[in-house]
């Protein structure tokens, strides 16, 4: 069944990083357009991306209202040029997305080392806190604001002159590590949510930053 000459969407997929959330689907439309609806389990359907010829819809504005809710979306197919009144009492064909819980499923974006500072044999490494589109009281929240202590960072560091890596962990955005005096070190960080048991538990590694370059500051004491 369904509206004449329209094909139901398929392969509905959530793509989400740091809560920026896009629903993607197939097929590329031929003589048809799409409208997306999104709902929470306790809410109701809201229409988005009306009569679009795209095969994606940015649903960030909806999911950031409550990132711990579970969302369901569906994509309706309409014949192009006949979206308002097809003269048919048939509902357009549609397909449901998988359920999506942003807090549990959004991917962690690649972190960035903001700075490092050496004081004697200690180095303080600071991870840049990424801003999200999640709001509280009209203020955008950082990744740390949203995840709190559920989010940790792992620091990988090694002497520039060798390949043996050491690791450190923090549930803040700062590390204080011991280093050998007179040695240059390189650093990379990774965001991790240990409570997750899925592939999206870890981010990709940050770009490598090495001492002796402009990001850091060294003070011999």
């Amino acid at each position: 069944s369904g509206t004449t000459n329209t094909v139901a969407a398929y392969n509905l997929t959530w793509k989400s990083t740091n809560f920026k959330t896009i629903l993607e689907w197939e097929p590329k439309p031929i003589n048809q357009v799409y409208t997306v609806q999104i709902s929470t389990k306790s809410g109701d359907w809201k229409s988005k991306c009306f009569y679009t010829a795209d095969t994606e819809c940015d649903l960030t504005d909806e999911i950031v209202k409550d990132v711990k809710q579970t969302y369901l979306a569906r994509v309706f197919s309409y014949p192009a040029g006949h979206v308002e009144s097809t003269g048919s009492t048939e509902e357009p064909p549609y397909e449901n997305s998988p359920e999506f819980t942003p807090y549990l499923e959004t991917n962690l974006g690649q972190p960035t080392i903001q700075s490092f500072e050496q004081v004697g044999t200690k180095v303080n490494v600071t991870v840049q806190d990424e801003w999200t589109l999640v709001r509280r009281n009209d203020t955008f929240l950082s990744l740390r604001d949203v995840f709190g202590k559920d989010l940790i960072y792992t620091l990988y560091y090694w002497k520039s002159s060798s390949s043996g890596k050491k690791t450190a962990k923090t549930n803040t955005n700062e590390f204080l590590i011991d280093v050998d005096k007179g040695e240059n070190y390189c650093f990379s960080v990774q965001a991790v949510i240990p409570s997750r048991r899925t592939a999206n538990r870890k981010s990709t590694d940050s770009p490598v930053e090495c001492m002796g370059h402009e990001k850091g500051e060294s003070r011999e004491i």
Partner: antibody, heavy 118, light 107 residues
Framework: QVQLVQSGAEVKQPGASVKVSCKAS????????MHWVRQAPGQGLEWMGM????????TYAQKFQGRVTLTVDTSTSTAYMELSSLRSEDTAVYYC???????????WGQGTLVTVSS | DIQETQSPSSLSASVGDRVTITCRAS??????LNWYQQKPGKAPKLLIY???RLQSGVPSRFSGSGSGTDYTLTISSLQPEDFATYYC?????????FGQGTKVEIK
């Protein structure tokens, strides 16, 4: 416990407007949608529309589009349904109902009888 | 819009009887089918949601089944307090629509 308390009965002239209120308590008002359903005397139930109190997003049944306006006042946890250009066939009991999922009306107000008569 | 056709429109039964009410939708509503009970002068009360899930506090003699376009409400052993009007309602797609109702009367 969840409670929806509606305003009292109204008698209106044809062509007038009526505004029915629904005060919610016992839950976080902005978390759940509010629906409005009416029932003419001796007749069945008819869905009029719904509103998301978190952002005032509304969806109306086409039959009522342009005549019904749903609003909320989050400071008092109150939903409102205003119906304009009243005619005799709008005589009905009007219910607010709290949503608990897509198209699901788990809690209902006691109803407000609106009588349209000249 | 999706239409619901309920049958029968009324029925007479005795206490202890097994009662079945059916609801047919004009198209597949993917199990988004709810049942309500209404007594005279009162607001409707949710009994069953999503075809077969019993609302909290509703006696287990009420049950629901079905799929696609055809759905059923069953009262396994009718009790005196069950004499009322029953409505099915599709929650698959706005505008949400109700069946015309089934009045269950005492035989």
């Amino acid at each position: 416990q969840v409670q929806l308390v509606q305003s009292g009965a109204e008698v209106k002239q044809p062509g007038a407007s009526v505004k029915v209120s629904c005060k919610a308590s016992g839950y976080t008002f902005t978390t759940y949608w509010m629906h409005w359903v009416r029932q003419a005397p001796g007749q069945g139930l008819e869905w009029m529309g719904m509103i998301d109190p978190s952002d005032s997003y509304t969806t109306y049944a086409q039959k009522f589009q342009g005549r019904v306006t749903l609003t909320v006042d989050t400071s008092t946890s109150t939903a409102y349904m205003e119906l304009s250009s009243l005619r005799s066939e709008d005589t009905a009991v009007y219910y607010c109902a709290r949503g608990s999922g897509p198209g699901l009306f788990a809690y209902w107000g006691q109803g407000t009888l609106v009588t349209v008569s000249s | 819009d999706i239409q619901e056709t309920q049958s029968p429109s009324s029925l007479s039964a005795s206490v202890g009887d097994r009662v079945t009410i059916t609801c047919r939708a004009s198209q597949d509503i993917r199990n988004y089918l709810n049942w309500y009970q209404q007594k005279p002068g009162k607001a409707p009360k949710l009994l069953i949601y999503h075809t077969s899930r019993l609302q909290s506090g509703v006696p287990s003699r009420f049950s629901g089944s079905g799929s696609g376009t055809d759905y059923t409400l069953t009262i396994s052993s009718l009790q005196p307090e069950d004499f009322a009007t029953y409505y099915c309602q599709q929650g698959n797609m706005p505008p949400y629509t109700f069946g015309q109702g089934t009045k269950v009367e005492i035989k």
